[in-house]
């Protein structure tokens, strides 16, 4: 996977008037490392490793840059014509990447009320607009405003990409200490379901790097893919990741199954615990809508935050 730096910014408007401030977070290689404190109007580290590794100068620079980007986004939102009453959002996701062959990529994506309406390649300055007429209208609105705005020249886009890549390289350098191997903590739980079947769930948490194999084995052999259900590998906010795998088995056959975990060249096998006390119905959480960081703020306002 390429190394990446991603910024997520959002501004809101209520009944046609753009709210002050903005929401923002930053991800380094998919890990949250920055959050913007709206009250203090400052970029702050997210996760212990960001705090430990990246110095005060980082947060000053990030605060300045985000403030400028936030203002740009607010001004753009004021020029979106179709704002009806109620709450609206404009979101920008900006990403730059360094690939293994040292090639680079850069892009930014704009969403209005959670719907993508414009993507730009920061290296070629090419724009892509979805087919829908709403997206076409929004994109035209915004690009017309940018044409009037002297700042939005090709040099500006190039500088934006160069700045992003420079930061990414700097963070990766200072982040050498981060790129250690943290083995996963694995735990297996059962939950009762109907007709003599139980669901066994194996959770791996607090691991780094992200690549992991988690699979159920029966009598020593891996189960087929279609008999297992996997969760996404998600950042847990501490610079590490979490995931899960589940399968349904006949009650009484628990001992034939083991959760097999493979991570960074090491593996472990984790059997199903015995005893009624370990049938945990409370473990049945909905893994599909697990959001991190600032999302709860947006949730309250029923605004979709694109990861």
């Amino acid at each position: 996977e390429p190394h990446s730096l991603r910024y997520n910014l959002m501004v809101l408007s209520q009944d046609g008037s753009v709210q002050s401030g903005f929401l923002a977070e930053g991800h380094l290689d998919g890990q949250p490392f920055l959050r913007y404190d709206r009250q203090k109007r400052r970029a702050k580290p997210q996760g212990q490793w960001a705090e430990d590794v990246l110095g005060a100068k980082t947060w000053d620079t990030e605060t300045e840059d985000l403030t400028e980007n936030g203002q740009d986004l607010r001004r753009t939102l004021t020029h979106i014509k179709d704002q009806k009453g109620g709450l609206h959002s404009l979101q920008e996701i900006r990403v730059c990447e360094i690939h293994e062959d040292s090639s680079t990529r850069g892009s930014r994506h704009f969403y209005y009320d959670g719907e993508l309406f414009l993507s730009q390649n920061l290296e070629t300055q090419e724009s892509t607009v979805p087919q829908s007429s709403r997206a076409q209208t929004l994109a035209m609105n915004v690009t017309n405003f940018w044409k009037e705005d002297a700042m939005k020249t090709k040099t500006h886009y190039r500088a934006m990409q160069a700045d992003c890549l420079q930061k990414l390289q700097r963070y990766l350098k200072s982040g050498v200490a981060i790129r250690r191997t943290v083995p996963p903590m694995v735990n297996v739980t059962c939950s009762e379901v109907s007709e003599g079947n139980i669901t066994v769930t194996c959770r791996a948490s607090s691991f780094y790097p992200r690549n992991i194999t988690l699979t159920w084995r029966q009598d020593g052999v891996s189960l087929s893919h279609n008999t297992q259900q996997w969760g996404d590998v998600l950042p847990d906010g501490n610079g590490t990741y979490q995931t899960w795998v589940a399968t349904r088995i006949r009650q009484g056959e628990e001992q034939r199954f083991t959760c097999y975990m493979e991570h960074s060249g090491n593996h472990g096998t984790h059997p199903v615990p015995s005893g009624k006390a370990l049938v945990l119905q409370s473990q049945r959480t909905d893994h599909h809508h697990h959001h991190h960081g600032l999302n709860d703020i947006f949730e309250a306002q029923k605004i979709e935050w694109h990861e």
């Epitope: 029966q218 020593g220 052999v221 001992q255 034939r256 083991t258 493979e262 593996h267 059997p271």
Partner: antibody, heavy 117, light 107 residues
């Protein structure tokens, strides 16, 4: 039928290394984990570690980290254990075995290692 | 690490007798216990797994029982071929340790 055929007895000098092999047959080699066990003369059994022949991933007993290196060759269905910096404490019979879930179902016949000057 | 304490360390019995070997774990191993028999100069052979399931081809005079931290292997009506060493091994969490072994000799 399932068989694990180990290499023959070894007599080696202290400070050297040795590589013991375990050739599997009668089943799909990459489907099961292979474990290694040590037994000193007249003593009990000690689990050294295991390897997934499909991926090469390993799981070592802390006690044997730095002493044993486990590898596997899929093309020949053979698992290997290399023991380094040998001392008389390493003189033992070494077994490979197949992990059949939560128990060891099949064992190799054992390889006797004698470390002597 | 989970420690397995096997007792007795050695045992003399006659053909036809019934013997019991015990294995105590230092923590709950949730029935993930196997018993092996080993004859002099040979590799161990699986007798019982999951604490009480008899392996294929093992005579029914062998039986395993127990749960939590206490497990035992019982051999009814000892036969001449039953003499040798017996080991328990747990598979709850690595390192998978073995008991110290029980040497069963003919009286």
């Amino acid at each position: 039928q399932v068989q694990l055929q180990q290499s023959g007895a070894e007599l080696v000098r202290p400070g050297t290394s040795v590589k013991v092999s375990c050739k599997a047959s009668g089943y799909a080699f990459t489907d099961y984990l292979i474990e290694w066990v040590k037994q000193r003369p007249g003593q009990g059994l000690e689990w050294i570690g295991g390897i997934n022949p499909g991926s090469g991933s390993t799981n070592y007993n802390e006690k044997f980290k730095g002493k044993a290196i486990l590898t596997a060759d899929k093309s020949s269905s053979t698992a290997y254990m290399q023991l380094s910096s040998l001392t008389s404490d390493d003189s033992a019979v070494y077994f490979c075995a197949r992990l059949d879930g939560n128990y060891v179902g099949y064992w190799g016949q054992g390889t006797t290692l004698t470390v002597s000057s | 690490d989970i420690l397995l304490t096997q007792s007795p360390a050695s045992l003399s019995a006659s053909v036809g007798e019934t013997v019991t070997i015990t294995c105590r774990a230092s923590g709950n191993i949730h029935n993930y216990l196997a018993w092996y028999q080993q004859k002099q100069g040979k590799s161990p052979q699986l007798l019982v797994y999951h604490a009480k399931t008899l392996a294929d081809g093992v005579p029914s005079r062998f039986s395993g029982s127990g749960s939590g931290t206490q497990y035992s292997l019982k051999i009814n009506s000892l036969q001449p071929e039953d003499f040798g060493s017996y080991y328990c091994q747990h598979f709850w969490s690595t390192p998978w340790t073995f008991g110290g072994g029980t040497k069963l000799e003919i009286k």
